[in-house]
Each structure stands twice: as C-alpha cells, then as structure tokens.
C-alpha cells in the first residue's frame, strides 16, 4: 500500500523536511503533490511526469520545494503555514489513479526565556511572590527549577497558567534559592538565568555573647550582639532602660559595681520595620581583700604542740577554704576545721605537717588565695647514727667517726669515750688508733630549741685479731620454691676479707646464689630444701682469720604427695587393716582420713580391726603443712573377700 | 590437757560475715602455725588459711583470698578466722589445726559448722 512518511514529524521553522514515498506501483505515468488531504487543482503544489522527466510548478508552488524520481519531495526553508496534510496523487500507465497523504508538524525555535517577578523583596511569613516564564509561547511546556533541582512538594508551592507562573505562598528565609524556568516544545528546549530570590526576614530576637553574667570589679565589660536578619539589623545598647549606643558591640571599660544591671540588645530591621529585643541581667562584684594566714604558734613541737591557723580577714556569709601540699584537706583525727572553717587546727604536730599551707575565700565568680605558709616543726633529735658501721679497727689507722641525727634547728653534737666528753663536734678524728683506744664511743645529739637530747653507743674494738664472725639472716625459716634468704656475715670490719662455706665446702656455682656488700652478705633465690645445709662465714686480714658457727638453715617445704603404706589393696576378711600415711614435709604435717568421703580420724596411722567385706572403697589421705600453707592428698582403693575365696591375698598386719 | 576449742560457726546468709574463734589450753601457741581446715561432703578437705607466730606469716587458699583473715593474740592464746563475703560454697565443718614450730606436735580442734544458704 502506498504510504507517506514525514522525515521529521515535528519540523523546526527554517529547517527542511522530506515526504518519503514508501511503496510506489510499477509502471506509472506521474505524480503530483499537493497541500491539504485531498486532490485539489488550485492547491497544486508540482507535478511530474516520468516520461519526460518534466516538474511542472503548480499554484501552491513556493519555489522551496522539489520532487525526486521516486515521488518524494524535499520542502526547504520550513515556515509556520507549511504546518498540515500533504497528498501524493500517483497516475499510473493504465491510467488508474492511487492516493496517499502525510503530514508533519512545524513549531519554532523558543527563545531563551526570562523570569519576572511580582515581588523583588518579599518579607518573611507575610508576603507571597509570583514568578513567570516570559515569553508567552504557544504550543510550549513549562518546568522549573530550584536551585538545579526539580520542584519540591510543598503546600506553599502552586503552578498555574499552564505552569507559566510558580507562585511561592508566605516565603520563609529558605525561600532564598535559585530560581530557574525551562521552555520545551518538540523541537528545542531553552534554560533561563538564574534569578535569586531576596526574603527579608527577622530580626530574630538577639543573642548576647559573652553569656557570661558575672563579672569582678576592675575587669573590662564586652559585649557582642547578634540577630539573625535580612538586611543586616541595626543594633542599640540600653543599660536599665537607658539608650547607650547604636552599635553591635558595647563596650566599658574597668567596671564597678555600679555597672551592675539589666543590659538590652534591640535590633531593628528597616526593611520589615520589625524590631526584637533581649536582655541580659549583669552582675560586677567587689574584689574580695586577698586572704592571708596568721599561726598561734610559729615554732610548734613535735608531738608536744598544736598549731591554729586562721584565715584572714573574717568576712561574713564568705566560705573559706584549705589547702595542704597544693592538695584538699585529707582525712585526718588531727586536723580540725572550726564551724565556719576559718580556723585550721593541727592537733599534736608532727615534722611532716611543715606544708606549706594556703587558704582561700571563695566568691560567686573565683577563689583567691593567699600566700603559701611554711610551718617551721621542732622535732628531734632522733636516735644518732654513727657511720661508718665499722666496729673492729686495726692498730695504726685513722678513726674518722661522724654522727647524725634528724633534728629541726640542727642538732649540736657531742663525743664521748668511756663516758669522757671527748669534744663538741659532729665529727671525731683520732689518727693512728692503738688498742687502747678501744672503749665505747657514745654521740650525743642535742636539739636547743626543744630542749630534748639523745644518745647512740659504739664499742669499737682496735686489734690486730680479728673477732669471731657470726651470721644474721633476714628469714629464718623460708618456703621452698618462694623465699629468698640473705645471710649476712657480722660484724662489718674495715680492710677485711669475707668468705663462705656451704657443708664445710667453698660455695657452689649456682645463679641462685649471689653474693654482695663486698662478698658480706650471701642471698639465695627461690630456695629449695636441699638448701637447708650449714652455712658459715669466715672474715680475714692480712693478720689474722676466723669463721663463725655454722648455722643451718630450716627450709620449710612440702607436704609432698603423701605415700600410703603398705602397698597392699587387697585383703581377706577377718585382717586387721593398718594403714599408714606419709608426706615429705617441714614442719611435719597434720594428718587425716577419709573413707568413702567420710572423715575419720586426724591421725598418721588408721586402724581398724578385722576387717569384712563392708571395709571395701576409697581411702584418702590428706596431709597439709600450717607452715607453708599448702595441702595434699592420696586415694587408695582397698577391696576386702571373704575369706579363702582368692588365693595370694594379703591375711593383714 | 592439750585442748582446741573452735566456736562461732552458724547459719548465715550469702555475703555475711563470721568470726571463728580456737582457744587453745594445755601449750602456748607463741612458737606454732595455726590453720583453719575446712570439710565439704563431696570436696576434698582444703587448707584455706594459716599463721606462723614466730614469722608473722600468712597464707591463704585462692580461694578465699581478700575475704577471709587469719589473726592470732598470743596473750589470750587464741586464733580466730574472720569470714567476709560467704558464698554457699563456704559451707563446710571448720578445723582448727595446730602444729609447733619444729613439727614435733600436731593438734586439732573438733571443728564448727558453717552453713552459708539464703
């Protein structure tokens, strides 16, 4: 069947379109083109007959078409009125006619559009806007687009006129956005600019910053004041109602007290003609005096005095606080705070409450502090220690003896020989000491300020000969596997040599032996029982040695798993069943029984007579050690027959 | 007469306390250890904490450890066991056991009954 197709359907003004023949009959005479849906001689457009390959023009000829061999025709330079049906009309040889029509559709090419407004300055909550596509275009859609993105869904957004107008009902300050409008129709499609939607909105009632609402007397007033606004709001100062300044910011120097008040922020928009305000309530305090301490006592005793300390000034409905070693007050029977803590008592003083010491008074904005107290505590003399330990000399050397003793004033000194005040010093110095300077050699501290005195006595001993050694130890009974010991060969002697002698043999090399102080002391690690041997100690010079007496150290260990005994597990009724039980240990353990879970008795051995049938089961021993805290135990099974039912079986003990 | 006297077990409820008391007449307890052994049907016996008067030494089984102090006073010749925290599996018969320092003598108490249920 013939057909015609329109190449495009929708055809831009200025362009060209092609009516393509599809399916022309064989054998034909000519065609002709004309306007409108049917043959209509006066709306001709050309003609064509094939045998002479002759176009003949007809009255609807625009000189802007032309017809092809194959029937088609080409219209060039598109206009609006092109827009309609166009019939071929098909003569063939037999002189039969044939008709087909198409059509196609012209539209022009949109200009780019623009967007009006009814509104350039809506105001926030009130006003609406209404924004239109221009130009009116026939036959054209409308889109629109808001900050690049297609329409949201709000009930405060309205299309109308064919979508031509958006209508934006009661703007907030979200509706500040980009807006864009888009013209299509089948043949272009045209953006507009941006166009930028001012709302003017606010002010929102005013933040004051800093929030801060307490200030000290001297320091500097600033204030900032901010409100969301479009345009930018104008801002006033008023002190208690007082207009000050049209600024944002307020300024005072060096505040009193009498800059106390309520402080107001007004902003005014002039656009909206709104005005919001906020108040903020300011409160400047007196600068409190800064404290300080007074004692009842500056030079307090050790365990003898008590101390007062007083916050000053006394001010009323004021909290004071304390402070020791830059640390809160700790918990203490001897520190008492009176009722309204201004008065700090250190009951029976000790040489470590010397501080220092601070109080505070505390106001609504800071605590201020006073200067750090010392307490100056008069303690000792302590025991005097005389150094060095040294107790045996050789004839000829130097003795250079000094004491020392903790005291607050500083202790005097004072040295004794056999009772004899020697000379008022804190060292004492003889040099090439004899035999006869052996004695007892006492220092005497004094303390002047508590009127306290004390003494500590050394025998030194001169002679060639050195004395018996002996050994102390620092545990005298270990557990093994967990204890260390230290043997410590006495006494300490200058220019002497120390040994040591395990079972009357030199020490043994073992990295849990080590040996210290100038081979004085022996330490053993992680001692075991077979540690438990005679240790000795000799000392000696280039004159003489000696060794101590052996001391045998006790290492407590176990209890072992205990050993039931005899081995037996199978007895004939009517034995005597004679059970004993043994453990490796030191001290020797505590003993007890079970049979069948059944405590018995707290005893080594278990007895029982004539045994039968009913003796059979579980029997466990236990065994534990006070000493090292540990515990053990053995289960034995033991089975009883009737007599003479099993050959080989034990008759007892 | 060598004599061990324990007292002040009892019924008491998860959580709560008790203080064992081992008088001890006939020796003095200066030169000894003195244990607490405890015995639950089904459990082995367990040595749960003892006190060597000559080293001041103390021991204790894991598990009681931090609930449960050993303590003696040598003038009244007693030691005592101070029971903190009671769980059921404190249930038991309590023994006071006695050893001297050389471990030339062993000495038990006949045992309190401590019952801990809600």
């Known amino acids: 069947k013939l057909t015609i197709e329109s190449t495009p359907f929708n055809v831009a003004e200025g362009k060209e379109v092609l009516l393509l023949v599809h399916n022309l009959p064989q054998h034909l005479f000519g065609y002709s083109w004309y306007k409108g849906e049917r043959v209509d001689g006066n709306r001709q457009i050309i003609g064509y007959v094939i045998g002479t390959q002759q176009a003949t023009p007809g009255p609807a000829y625009s000189g802007r078409e032309i017809i092809y061999p194959n029937a088609s025709l080409l219209i060039q330079n598109i206009i609006q009125n092109d827009t309609g049906f166009y019939t071929l009309h098909v003569i063939k040889s037999d002189l039969v006619n044939e008709e087909a029509t198409g059509q196609f559709r012209v539209y022009p090419e949109l200009p780019k559009p623009s967007i009006s407004s009814n509104n350039s300055k809506p105001v926030e909550d009130k006003d609406a806007v209404a924004f239109t596509c221009e130009p009116e275009t026939q036959d054209a859609t409308y889109l629109w687009w808001v900050n690049n993105q297609s329409l949201p869904v709000s009930p405060r957004l309205q299309l109308s006129n064919g979508n031509r107008t958006l209508t934006l009902f009661n703007v907030t300050r979200n509706d500040t956005a980009s807006y864009k409008c888009e013209t299509q129709n089948p043949v272009s499609a045209r953006r507009s600019d941006s166009v930028i939607l001012n709302v003017l909105y606010g002010p929102d009632a005013p933040t004051i910053s800093p929030l801060n609402t307490s200030y000290r007397s001297g320091e500097n007033l600033n204030l900032s004041c901010h409100a969301a606004s479009n345009p930018p709001a104008q801002y006033s100062w008023f002190v208690n109602g007082t207009f000050q300044q049209s600024t944002q910011e307020l300024f005072i120097p060096n505040i009193t007290v009498n800059n106390s008040g309520s402080y107001t922020c007004q902003a005014h928009n002039s656009d909206t003609g709104l005005n919001r305000t906020t108040v903020t309530t300011i409160t400047v305090y007196a600068e409190p005096p800064k404290p300080f301490i007074t004692s009842n006592n500056s030079n307090p005793v050790e365990d003898e005095d008590a101390v007062a300390l007083t916050c000053e000034p006394e001010i009323q409905n004021t909290t004071y606080l304390w402070w020791v070693n830059n640390q809160s007050l700790p918990v203490s029977p001897r520190l008492q705070l009176s009722n309204d803590n201004r008065t700090l008592t250190l009951l029976s003083v000790t040489r470590n409450d010397v501080g220092p010491y601070e109080c505070g008074i505390q106001n609504e904005l800071s605590v201020d502090h006073s200067d750090p107290v010392i307490l100056n505590v008069l303690y000792g003399p302590d025991d005097p220690t005389i150094s060095p330990s040294y107790t045996y000399y050789r004839p000829g050397v130097n003795l250079s003896l000094s004491c020392h003793a903790a005291s607050n004033p500083p202790a005097q000194y004072s040295w004794l020989i056999d009772g004899n005040i020697q000379q008022h010093t804190q060292e004492l110095f003889i040099s090439n000491i004899t035999e006869k300077n052996s004695g007892l050699y006492t220092c005497q501290a004094n303390n002047s300020a508590s009127g306290h005195s004390r003494t500590t006595v050394k025998t030194i001993t001169v002679s060639a000969e050195l004395p018996k050694p002996s050994i102390s130890s620092n545990n005298s009974k270990p557990v093994e596997d967990k204890d260390a010991v230290a043997f410590t060969c006495e006494p300490e002697a200058q220019n002497t040599t120390y040994l040591w002698w395990v079972n009357g043999q030199s020490l043994p090399v073992s990295p849990r032996l080590q040996l210290s102080n100038g081979n004085r002391t022996l330490t053993l690690f992680n001692v075991t029982r077979n540690d438990a041997r005679a240790y000795v100690c000799g000392i000696q010079n280039s004159v003489s040695a000696n060794r101590s007496d052996p001391v045998t150290l006790d290492v407590l260990y176990g209890p072992d798993t205990p050993i039931i005994s005899p081995p037996d597990s199978s007895y004939l009724s009517g034995a005597n069943l004679n059970l004993s039980c043994h453990s490796a240990s030191n001290p020797s353990p505590q003993y007890s029984w079970r049979i069948n879970g059944i405590p018995q008795q707290h005893t080594q051995v278990l007895f029982i007579a004539k045994i039968t049938p009913n003796n059979n089961g579980t029997y466990a021993c236990f065994v534990s050690n006070l000493a090292t805290g540990r515990n053990n135990s053995i289960v034995k099974s033991i089975t009883v027959s009737a007599s003479g039912t099993s050959p080989g079986l034990s008759a007892g003990a | 007469e060598v004599q061990l006297v324990e007292s002040g077990g009892g019924l008491v409820q998860p959580g709560g306390s008790l203080r064992l008391s081992c008088a001890a007449s006939?020796?003095?307890?200066?030169?000894?250890?003195i244990g607490w052994v405890r015995r639950a049907p089904g459990k082995e016996e367990e040595l749960v904490a003892s006190i060597c008067q000559y080293s001041g030494y103390t021991r204790y089984a894991d598990s009681v450890k931090g609930r449960f102090t050993i303590s003696a006073d040598t003038s009244k010749n007693t030691a005592y066991l101070q029971m903190n925290s009671l769980r059921a599996e404190d249930t038991a018969v309590y023994y006071c056991a006695i050893t001297s320092h050389h471990g030339d003598y062993n000495y038990w108490g006949q045992g309190t009954t401590v019952t801990v249920s809600s």
């Open positions: 006939g020796f003095n307890i200066k030169d000894t250890c």
